[in-house]
């Protein structure tokens, strides 16, 4: 697995740098997770043929992943710094349950994909001390996540494969669109 | 060094199917991301659409349903194909590598080497 | 579809400073990029990423952005800068792109 974000050779050799920003943090986290995300569809796509499925096809799917739309603030017309960061971590806390489900998907790449998920929970808590209105995020239920992994992991072995696919491929674009809207803030 | 180098016939007739390919050296297709632009005689450039490292793809809406981009990583190429061309596509095609910060926002338009470009004429 | 503006043509002298700008909704959010072509030439990358300089470009040119307008200067113009100068951001939901209209840069 790539070394965290912080603990790379350019940190060691330069002790005396300054200690990254909040934003700085939240940036490098991201970028750490998009790099792990692209290489675990390395080995989903040399698996299987899903990475040739067209995002029309791909969108067929009763997955009800987390998407950034017009009313979350977080595009340049109508953004909204408070609503963005609320949509941004509603969205990766959806994210971790499908982030679990990924764990046993994975051969050669389990260490990656246990990174991915650690990741994104240090990310939550770097994007909760940013936010000042905590109480409108909505934490999901674990009932209904327990059930849901369930579910999904009683698939048969094509529908694992493209719901292993659209994660991954939905939390790339999630991010992207976190990333970009972050930059504005 | 990082070049790029379109290749495909200079000539295509109309309702055809136009089909490019940028070949690539200096770089790896799992690293960056390629795009497509193409500038017709006099115009202003228009971005026709690209292939990120993972292989996602993205379209310009208006060509959407002509347009396809794939790309072999192994040749170190990736091709375009536009479909039932007119005499309006007549235009420099340009294969470009898209930035490596690009691959985090999305920002796959955001490009930072370029091919020289090819004419490309539909006519009959 | 985002649309930019850009002033359609720009004079200055040899040796001083031009500002290009380009304007759009989009450009807060995405990056912006600066392209030259000179006459019956190729398109090549001045400026990517709002700011960065491809290596080969000269420190003379430089990319920033404020708000909803990015803003290519060429400081001590040169005979060689005049050409056209295209700006390009992102067209938003798709992560498709956009060009400017483009401006001739005419050196005196």
């Known amino acids: 697995a790539p070394v965290p974000p912080g603990e790379d050779s350019k940190d060691v050799a330069a002790p005396h740098r300054q200690p990254l920003t909040s934003s700085e943090r939240i940036d490098k986290q991201i970028r750490y997770i998009l790099d792990g995300i692209s290489a675990l569809r390395k080995e989903t796509c040399n698996k299987s043929n899903m990475c040739e499925s067209s995002k029309e096809a791909l969108a067929e799917n009763n997955l009800n992943l987390p998407k950034m739309a017009e009313k979350d603030g977080c595009f340049q017309s109508g953004f909204n710094e408070e609503t963005c960061l609320v949509k941004i971590i509603t969205g990766l806390l959806e994210f971790e349950v499908y982030l679990e489900y990924l764990q046993n998907r994975f051969e050669s790449s389990e260490e990656q994909a246990r990174a991915v998920q650690m990741s994104t929970k240090v990310l939550i808590q770097f994007l909760q001390k940013k936010a000042k209105n905590l109480d409108a995020i909505t934490t999901p239920d674990p009932t209904t996540n327990a059930s849901l992994l369930t579910k999904l992991q009683a698939q048969n072995q094509w529908l694992q494969d493209m719901t292993t696919h659209l994660i991954l491929r939905s939390f790339k674009e999630f991010l992207q669109s976190s990333l970009r809207a972050l930059r504005q803030m | 060094q990082v070049q790029l180098q379109e290749s495909g016939p200079s000539l295509v007739k109309p309702s055809q199917t136009l089909s490019l390919t940028c070949t690539v050296s200096?770089?790896?297709?799992?690293?960056?991301?390629v795009g497509w632009v193409r500038q017709a005689p006099g115009k202003t450039p228009e971005w026709l659409g690209g292939i990120d490292r993972d292989g996602d793809m993205s379209y310009n809406p208006a060509l959407k349903s002509r347009l396809s981009i794939t790309r072999d990583t192994s040749k170190s190429q990736v091709s375009l194909s536009l479909r039932s061309v007119a005499t309006e596509d007549t235009a420099v095609y340009y294969c470009?590598?898209?930035?490596?910060?690009?691959?985090?926002?999305?920002?796959?338009?955001?490009?930072?080497?370029w091919g020289r470009g090819l004419l490309v004429t539909v006519s009959s | 579809q985002a649309v930019l503006t850009q002033p359609s043509s720009v004079s200055k002298s040899l040796g001083q400073s031009v500002s290009i700008t380009c304007s759009g909704s989009?450009?807060?959010?995405?990056?912006v990029g600066w392209y030259q072509q000179l006459p019956g030439s190729g398109l090549k990358t001045i400026i990517y990423s709002t700011s960065s300089r491809p290596s080969g470009v000269p420190d003379r040119f430089s990319g920033s952005k404020s708000g909803n307008t990015a803003t290519l200067t060429i400081s001590s113009l040169q005979a060689e800068d005049e050409a056209d100068y295209y700006c390009?951001?992102?067209?938003?939901?798709?992560?498709?792109?956009?060009f400017g209209s483009g401006t001739r840069l005419t050196v005196l």
């Open positions: 470009a590598r898209s930035s490596y910060d690009s691959h985090y926002y999305g920002d796959y338009y955001d490009v930072d080497v």
């Open positions: 390009a951001t992102g067209d938003r939901g798709n992560y498709g792109g956009v």
């Open positions: 989009n450009i807060g959010s995405s990056a």
């Open positions: 200096g770089f790896s297709l799992t690293s960056y991301g």
